[in-house]
């Protein structure tokens, strides 16, 4: 089938002990090969500080996956979710202020 770019959605959890869990979800993409990783100041976080979900079919002939990490409250601006899929790429910021989600469809 033809390439379908992912929808990327970044969310924050509630604060606990000065930390926030940020999750980056990619959905509705094809083919299934994708790079999804958290960056700090543009540098990829080490693997042992990130959690990845499996790349799973989402029932529409496309796929979904996620990656999460914990960051210190107040440092949200330093972090982005980096996505590469079928020759396209993008960086996705952690939402700031009262907004707790951000999504973008790649074309």
């Amino acid at each position: 089938g033809s390439t379908v770019p992912p929808m990327v959605n970044v969310t924050c959890s509630e604060v606990s002990e000065g930390n926030i869990t940020v999750t980056c979800r990619a959905s509705s993409f094809y083919p299934r090969n994708i790079t999804l990783t958290w960056r700090q100041d543009g540098v990829s976080l080490s693997h042992n500080t990130q959690q990845w979900g499996d790349v799973l079919p989402d029932g529409n002939g496309t796929y979904q996956t996620w990656v999460a990490t914990r960051i210190r409250q107040g440092e949200e601006q330093r972090f982005t979710c980096y996505m590469e899929h079928s020759g396209n790429h993008g960086t996705h910021p952690v939402p700031s202020g009262n907004s707790h989600h951000h999504h973008h469809h790649h074309h």
Epitope: D41, G42, V43, L45, S46, Y82, E84, H89, T91
Partner: antibody, heavy 118, light 108 residues
């Protein structure tokens, strides 16, 4: 081959502004941050700030926040540093660098000497 | 701000000798955020070691890095003529990003 090519040397008077350009090649321009660092003659390295060319996010060293402006032109894949209200202590070599997969500065430009003198 | 203090300021050694350079941080740094750069006169710095102990691409195996917490070390097992340069440590854990003041390795 990844390269970052910077604009040529500049001589400026105190109070003036300078704009230094940095044109990377050999990779997708918007996939990595562009950092700026300066080095006064005979001195160490000082981080100025960085810009994410994809989303335009800029993080400054607070010491430079009031006088430095980082921008990118995605149409020409070029990054810029503008420094205003120049003083003699701004005389330095200004470097651009690319954020790496595992380190902050993995490739560097050749440097641009900015001399501030009356 | 995390201050990185490098010692010694200058190291005078002969080719073939072992060089040990220290970088001490004012606050603890995760080993993932400590990097080393080499700079020769008139040139831009180049990445030497990333994340405390990993050699950057094209860097010979005589270079090694170690350390944790506040104390980090760069070792050159046997100095070659091209290794005489200034070496900087750098931390990326906290803003502002900071560099040590450098250690100059010069020919004795």
């Amino acid at each position: 081959e990844i390269q970052l090519v910077q604009s040529g040397a500049e001589v400026k008077k105190p109070g003036a502004s300078v704009k230094v350009s940095c044109k990377p090649s050999g990779y997708a321009f918007t996939s990595n941050n562009i950092y700026w660092v300066r080095q006064a003659p005979g001195q160490g390295l000082e981080w100025i700030g960085y810009i994410d060319p994809y989303i335009g996010r800029i993080i400054y060293n607070q010491q430079f926040k009031d006088r430095a402006t980082l921008t990118v032109d995605k149409s020409t894949s070029t990054a810029y540093l503008e420094l205003s209200s120049l003083r003699s202590e701004d005389t330095a070599v200004y470097y651009c660098s690319r954020s790496g997969e595992r380190s902050n500065f993995d490739y560097w430009g050749q440097g641009t000497l900015v001399t501030v003198s009356s | 701000e995390i201050v990185l203090t490098q010692s010694p300021a200058t190291l005078s050694l002969s080719p073939g000798e072992r060089a040990t350079l220290s970088c001490s941080a004012s606050s603890s740094i995760s080993s993932n955020y400590l990097h080393w750069y080499q700079q020769k006169p008139g040139q831009a710095p180049r990445l030497l070691i990333y994340r405390t102990s990993n050699l950057a691409s094209g860097i010979p195996a005589r270079f090694s890095g170690s350390g944790s917490g506040t104390d980090f070390t760069l070792t050159i097992s046997s100095l070659e003529p091209e290794d005489f340069a200034v070496y900087y440590c750098q931390q990326g854990g906290s803003l502002p990003l900071t560099f040590g003041q450098g250690t100059k390795v010069e020919i004795k």
